[in-house]
Amino acid sequence: IWELKKDVYVVELDWYPDAPGEMVVLTCDTPEEDGITWTLDQSSEVLGSGKTLTIQVKEFGDAGQYTCHKGGEVLSHSLLLLHKKEDGIWSTDILKDQKEPKNKTFLRCEAKNYSGRFTCWWLTTISTDLTFSVKSSRGSSDPQGVTCGAATLSAERVRGDNKEYEYSVECQEDSACPAAEESLPIEVMVDAVHKLKYENYTSSFFIRDIIKPDPPKNLQLKPLKNSRQVEVSWEYPDTWSTPHSYFSLTFCVQVQGKSKREKKDRVFTDKTSATVICRKNASISVRAQDRYYSSSWSEWASVPCS
Amino acid sequence: RNLPVATPDPGMFPCLHHSQNLLRAVSNMLQKARQTLEFYPCTSEEIDHEDITKDKTSTVEACLPLELTKNESCLNSRETSFITNGSCLASRKTSFMMALCLSSIYEDLKMYQVEFKTMNAKLLMDPKRQIFLDQNMLAVIDELMQALNFNSETVPQKSSLEEPDFYKTKIKLCILLHAFRIRAVTIDRVMSYLNAS
């Protein structure tokens, strides 16, 4: 048993049929010694008396809020949550496996630049009685500070018959140098509580590996005289790290016909313009990637050819 | 990226082209190591991230873009103790800091070159003959060092008498390649920045 926060405790249980459970000793937070009684939840049924209560926690019915009283007055509460371990593996019932980039990926994180700010998100099919808290640090043995906000519901999607809820959180490394070479990964820890079930999820990464620039901005076409060619120009996204001559991007320019089956023409360039042939009903798209460290490409920025 | 690429003109700055070749070479070598040593802990998640130049050079600090010198988090340890000559310094306007920066890069390359050569000598003794260092990568390191052209004492190649532990050597190779790739990225950024300046 360990304390998650004030008056909230997590009991770690091996979860299998007829498991013996865990013996837990609760202590009433009071200077009083006599006349103390204990109840579970809002029940008036007395479970025991005395400053301490020893209970055998086996299942969810044994979790909940234990209260010690004296003469009708509440002295203190202890909320017990359960953390299930099945076949030696901690349960992951609350969050959905996103399976990208690999199986057992519950948390996904992205950064738009090297400022030390990043966003993580996760999915669940649960919509009520759910709370999350997020902690993060750079490294784990001698952790350096990363500050995370509150997790918020960022999207709802219908997947077949089920609804899926996306939660996200923004974090910022307290003292980040965009040019630094990371040797210790960022650790992100999410505590998830659904009713009386506790689970924790972790992710470890370097900012350089989760970089995904915003799409290029101000995408424009300039037709070239007496030619089917156009000059496509764009700019670095506002959110990208500066100076751009140090944090350089490379770009992919694509000409795509109306039909998905049509052949795509692609050109790669380090410049912020390119000359391409614009076909009727086609569109021109440009995306960006760090020029020197191949993390994710941005989403496409697009303009129609006409 | 095997599709058409509009390549930039190397410009006035002779080291930019070499640094781009260096990054390409080390990235290819790292990819080859990951594939060849698939049953060894060789991915970024599996290895310990060690920097052999730590406390010996300070490339990130010495080569910091002016725009980032206002960021206190970037100014933790600006050790400035490097030699100041070299043929990449094409302009008389080159500042003292730029000289320190390029000198620091040179020292990095020299250290990695020694490590890689020592390691290659061990790998050549491996009866499995599983992996060797790409000669192209070693040549590219050499070319960039020559372009930087700093006068510096030669570091003797480490030789060891004991029988090498090939498993450890291969893991050390992965660690070294990961670290060198990260340093090569920094070098490329620096050269690009200096070229634009």
Epitope: Q42, Q65, D93, T125, T128, D129, D161, H194 | -
Partner: antibody, heavy 120, light 107 residues
Framework: EVTLRESGPGLVKPTQTLTLTCTLY??????????VSWIRQPPGKGLEWLAH???????YYNPSLKSQLTISKDTSKNQVVLKLTSVDPVDTATYYC????????????WGQGTLVTVSS | DIQMTQSPSSLSASVGDRVTITCKAS??????VAWFQQKPGKAPKLLIY???NRYTGVPDRFSGSGYGTDFTFTISSLQPEDIATYYC?????????FGGGTKVEIK
């Protein structure tokens, strides 16, 4: 002793707004972890959950009725109020409020219910 | 919405009989299932929560089991006072939904 008591108009005309009040005795909605749900049961039919409010004001609604429902609390009076707008004869039902806490997450105490008839 | 399909819709049994009611969820609801008893003209009463936990003061002849999508409610020895309609309810996900009910009568 924990009890909940619903009160409502008994008869409402179609298109009007139905306002129901649940008064709580023996526990306080200002206590951390306390919550109250509303459930209804048309004559001779099953139960339908409508809305829930927690002590901190956080609430959940049945999506099929969300646009018509508003749940609120008056901590000083220890009351929970449910408003259902644009009522229709199909909203004729016995309306129950029930306590649901963040400790056993079950509707453990129910009011006796109040019958509301929607008719012109 | 998660559908809770309860069966049978009604049953008739003798005093002392073992009575079993099942509830099937249209998707996994973990163990977030409660069972209620409702007597004519009265409000429902909580019997079981978290699928298998008997609420305070509920006689031990009432029990529940199940996890995921399949849940069972059992009265080990039917008593005359058990004549009522029994409902299962999931609160894994909003909207919280009830089964259609099972009316239990004495033969």
């Amino acid at each position: 002793e924990v009890t909940l008591r619903e009160s409502g108009p008994g008869l409402v005309k179609p298109t009007q707004t139905l306002t129901l009040t649940c008064t709580l005795y023996g526990f306080s909605l200002s206590t951390s972890g306390m919550g109250v749900s509303w459930i209804r049961q048309p004559p001779g039919k099953g139960l339908e959950w409508l809305a829930h409010i927690w002590w901190d004001g956080d609430n959940y609604y049945n999506p099929s009725l969300k646009s018509q429902l508003t749940i609120s609390k008056d901590t000083s009076k220890n009351q929970v109020v449910l408003k259902l707008t644009s009522v229709d004869p199909v909203d004729t039902a016995t309306y129950y409020c029930a306590r649901r806490t963040r400790v056993n997450y079950a509707m453990d105490y129910w009011g006796q219910g109040t019958l509301v008839t929607v008719s012109s | 919405d998660i559908q809770m399909t309860q069966s049978p819709s009604s049953l008739s049994a003798s005093v002392g009989d073992r009575v079993t009611i099942t509830c099937k969820a249209s998707q996994s609801v973990s163990n977030d299932v409660a069972w209620f008893q409702q007597k004519p003209g009265k409000a429902p009463k909580l019997l079981i929560y978290y699928a298998s936990n008997r609420y305070t003061g509920v006689p031990d002849r009432f029990s529940g089991s199940g996890y995921g999508t399949d849940f069972t409610f059992t009265i080990s020895s039917l008593q005359p006072e058990d004549i009522a309609t029994y409902y299962c309810q999931q609160d894994y996900n909003s909207p919280w939904t009830f089964g259609g009910g099972t009316k239990v009568e004495i033969k």
